[in-house]
């Protein structure tokens, strides 16, 4: 293959591969906990936003989807499933109503939502 | 790698790979002809929509982007850059205004537009 071309992955079959990360958008609406369980069952996690450059495909994503960001009531912080803290200036997250989970929307926006509300979701698997 | 996982591609570096097709979304606004030339310079063509199943990632694309669909005034048909005719029931084409080129919008919609209007665009490369 030409030097300018390369393979991406490995990823689960029929997932999107971009800059060696794997993504899948799931159409069925589930609450946050069910969405998390669905991703975990596929050796993945809910979407983690860690880089505007490496994840610029997310700019153009339509609609709202659960991502792996949750509120930790004990200290009031927001963190990803892996325990890492939300980095500043990565996402513009708005709390329009009470909630402890977050939806991803286009242009690196997030909406805080009640975790028990069903929504579509994005799973992500980082390749090594 | 696990049997359930696979590599995707090959694709140009940092393009999106999905079901062995390569896609790239370009931010800069160009007219249709410039967009076509840009894709060709990267050994690709403007987006061709050929399958709702194989290209279901396009459902979630936000905004409007040039694709490779053009009007042939001599016979009144719409065809892709490669000369193939637009298959029925693939795209819902909406004639917002007079034009011979088409923009792709989410949920498999196409908007007819004047070819000289600048817009963002999607390049696509089909892997063998």
């Amino acid at each position: 293959i030409p030097l300018t071309e390369s393979y991406c992955g490995p990823c689960p079959k029929n997932w999107i591969c971009y800059k060696n990360n794997c993504y899948q958008f799931f159409n069925e609406s589930k609450n946050w906990y069910e969405s998390q369980a669905s991703c975990m069952s596929q050796n993945a996690s809910l979407l983690k936003v860690y880089s505007k450059e490496d994840q610029d495909l997310l700019k153009l994503v339509k609609s709202y989807h659960w991502m792996g960001l949750v509120h930790i009531p004990t200290n009031g912080s927001w963190q990803w499933e892996d325990g890492s803290i939300l980095s500043p200036n990565l996402l513009t997250i708005i709390e329009m109503q009470k909630g402890d989970c977050a939806l991803y929307a286009s242009s690196f926006k997030g909406y805080i939502e009640n975790c028990s509300i069903p929504n579509t979701y994005i799973c992500m698997q980082r390749t090594v | 790698i696990p049997l359930t996982e696979s590599y995707c591609g090959p694709c140009p570096k940092n393009w999106i790979c999905y079901k062995n097709n390569c896609y790239q979304f370009f931010n800069e606004s160009k007219n249709w002809y410039e967009s076509q030339a840009s894709c060709m310079s990267q050994n690709a063509s403007l987006l061709k929509v050929y399958s709702k199943e194989d290209q279901d990632l396009l459902k979630l694309v936000k905004s409007y982007h040039w694709m490779g669909l053009v009007h042939i005034p001599t016979n009144g048909s719409w065809q892709w850059e490669d000369g193939s005719i637009l298959s029925p029931n693939l795209l819902t084409i909406i004639e917002m205004q007079k034009g011979d080129c088409a923009l792709y919008a989410s949920s498999f919609k196409g908007y007819i537009e004047n070819c000289s209007i600048p817009n963002t665009y999607i390049c696509m490369q089909r892997t063998v």
């Epitope: 912080s77 939300l86 286009s106 690196f108 | -």
Partner: antibody, heavy 123, light 107 residues
Framework: EVQLVQSGAEVKEPGESLKISCKNS????????VGWVRQMPGKGLEWMGI????????RYSPSFQGQVTISADKSINTAYLQWSSLKASDTAMYYC????????????????WGQGTLVTVSS | EIVLTQSPATLSLSPGERATLSCRAS??????LAWYQQKPGQAPRLLIY???NRATGIPARFSGSGSGTDFTLTISSLEPEDFAVYYC?????????FGQGTKVEIK
Amino acid sequence: EVQLVQSGAEVKEPGESLKISCKNSGYSFTNYWVGWVRQMPGKGLEWMGIIYPGDSDTRYSPSFQGQVTISADKSINTAYLQWSSLKASDTAMYYCGRLTMFRGIIIGYFDYWGQGTLVTVSS
Amino acid sequence: EIVLTQSPATLSLSPGERATLSCRASQSVSSYLAWYQQKPGQAPRLLIYDASNRATGIPARFSGSGSGTDFTLTISSLEPEDFAVYYCQQRSNWPWTFGQGTKVEIK
């Protein structure tokens, strides 16, 4: 220094259209949401809606949905509020404001306000 | 939508006195409530957010308390510049809403 500067007072007749502006400076316009609040003469405050200038995502309060249009031009750090056909009942002071950021999250309070634009609709 | 009811409508006090303003929500808003001050001819100013946090630059004589449906703004010792209209606002549910205001006037 964060500043929101609104366009000047307007006197219009019923049925006319109008677009008022809110120029933002001193912060990253696309990292926050901006909103509009109405205050009718001698009355309290009412939320109209909010906009994210990064991609013009907009949320309207149900009572203002379809009555006004909120927009933004991120290239000039300006938010707008417009009417296609004014009514006498649109007579009010209109304030724009920037939503607060707390622990990295945008929350629904204005920490900075414009000076207000008085709109008078009368025949 | 959530209705906020402020009381009293008017509070007549002298400088140096303690002012206690009340805001009651039609349903629980948790601690998602703010207080603003508005003087004639001016835009409102954020005083307290999320029930008890003082906004930047707000003097310590202003304090907020409460959660659920009942909230209080207290001004421990009124200064001449504190005579104004005070509004509460909830952000617990969209659309966000304001109370109708309490006017604190000089007795």
